[in-house]
């Protein structure tokens, strides 16, 4: 069985998580992408996506939540602004292919949030000021209800990151649950 | 065990050329971006060139912008720096350094290999 | 472009004693700060980054905080190997990803 990395960030309250998934830009350039969580012993639940066709370099907004899909770079990227120690957890991006099973892209992200805001004097981040300028055309798109007939496989646990390296493509099944969180205006 | 091997500095004279190579082992090398970080003597840290690992996309500082080239042959799991036209201030140690899936910070890297431009 | 500054340049302190070195970008980077130590005829080494995570392996003696344009690197005692130079760098939006021009800790 291949083994997933993750990579752990560790952030105080109030700060932003700003992380890149790489993707190949001939296979996934305007595929449907999305931002999940993995909860212990859970299906993953898809938390944010981009429209379909994925848009180049237009946020899409849901909460907290900002995806950013840069087709000429072949990157999405995601922020979670203002975060909360509620948000800890782990996370993934993947790319929506229907009919075939999300594709996943590695490695998955282990967040910890902790009290109290990292800030030093000066700093033009704190847990009122962080949320990001988005443009006003900031949209929020649709998840599809990704339902694979499979078993649903078990989540890690919160345990240490393996640090062993995947060695083959992983392709989701248990994608099931979708929340819908309200746009920031 | 990560480990990245440079190879293919020396001494060469303005107007020259080189190319270096890095051979790693230990991880999935086509999935994970990869840069060239340089240090000229008694220096600090200054960014080179990034390729990304699916994308495949190439980005390069001003200063080599033109005359350096980035590739990676996944097959053989190596990266290069073709160096054209090369300058007296090019002279510096050259790493190759693995970045992190989700971000262009660079966890492992290379011991260096010495690139000295002198006419 | 963003510009990283580090201070002080060199920062001479006692073995055993706390050293704070500060890095400060020319603009917002928000978390997307990493520290790394380097020793001389080494290759650097990450130590912190996203400004708080400590990188696999590195004692806690080392700790990042700050965001946004102000950070600091705190050794909270000084041990004899960790006499190096020290650098942040940012990976926020897009290349060239820059650097500080390095902070030195030496044995006072």
């Known amino acids: 069985a291949t083994k997933l990395t993750e990579e752990k960030y560790e952030l105080k309250e109030g700060q932003t998580l700003d992380v890149k998934c790489d993707y190949t830009l001939e296979k996934f350039a305007s595929s449907q992408k999305a931002w999940q969580i993995i909860r212990d012993g859970e299906m993953p639940k898809t938390l944010a996506c981009t429209e379909r066709p994925s848009k180049n370099s237009h946020p899409v907004q849901v909460g907290r939540i900002i995806l950013e899909d840069y087709h000429d770079h072949g990157l999405l990227r995601v922020r979670m602004v203002n975060l909360q120690v509620e948000d800890s957890g782990l996370y993934q991006c993947v790319i929506y292919q229907p009919p075939k099973e999300p594709h996943m892209l590695f490695d998955r992200i282990r967040l910890v949030v902790t009290k109290g805001f990292s800030g030093t004097p000066g700093s033009n981040e704190n847990s009122t000021q962080n949320v990001y300028k988005i443009p006003p055309t900031t949209t929020k798109a649709l998840c599809p209800l990704y339902t694979s007939p499979r078993t649903v496989t078990q989540a890690p646990p919160k345990s240490t990151a393996d640090v062993s390296t995947p060695d083959s493509e992983i392709n989701l099944t248990n994608v099931t649950d979708i929340i819908r969180v309200p746009v920031f205006n | 065990e990560v480990q990245l091997l440079e190879s293919g500095g020396g001494m060469v004279q303005p107007g020259g050329s080189l190319r270096l190579s890095c051979a790693v082992s230990?991880?999935?090398?086509?999935?994970?971006?990869m840069s060239w970080v340089r240090q000229a003597p008694g220096k600090g840290l200054e960014w080179v060139s990034e390729?990304?690992?699916?994308?495949?996309?190439?980005y390069y500082a001003d200063s080599v912008k033109g005359r350096f080239t980035i590739s990676r042959d996944n097959s053989k799991n190596t990266l290069y720096l073709q160096m054209n036209s090369l300058r007296v201030e090019d002279t510096a140690i050259y790493y190759c350094?693995?970045?992190?899936?989700?971000?262009?910070?660079?966890?492992?890297w290379g011991q260096g290999t010495l690139v000295t431009v002198s006419s | 472009e963003i510009v990283m500054t580090q201070s002080p340049a060199t920062l001479s302190v006692s073995p055993g004693e706390r050293a704070t070195l500060s890095c400060r970008a020319s603009?917002?980077?928000?978390?997307?700060l990493a520290w790394y130590q380097q020793k001389p005829g080494q290759a650097p080494r990450l130590l912190i980054y996203?400004?708080?995570t400590r990188a696999t392996g590195i004692p806690a003696r080392f700790s990042g905080s700050g965001s946004g344009t102000e950070f600091t690197l705190t050794i909270s005692s000084l041990q004899s190997e960790d006499f190096a130079v020290y650098y942040c760098?940012?990976?926020?939006?897009?290349?060239?990803?820059?650097f500080g021009q390095g902070t030195k800790v030496e044995i006072k």
């Open positions: 350094a693995k970045e992190f899936s989700s971000n262009s910070l660079f966890d492992y």
């Open positions: 230990g991880f999935t090398f086509s999935r994970y971006a």
């Open positions: 390729m990304r690992g699916s994308s495949g996309s190439t």
């Open positions: 603009q917002s980077v928000n978390s997307n």
């Open positions: 996203g400004a708080s």
């Open positions: 760098q940012q990976f926020y939006n897009w290349p060239p990803w820059t």
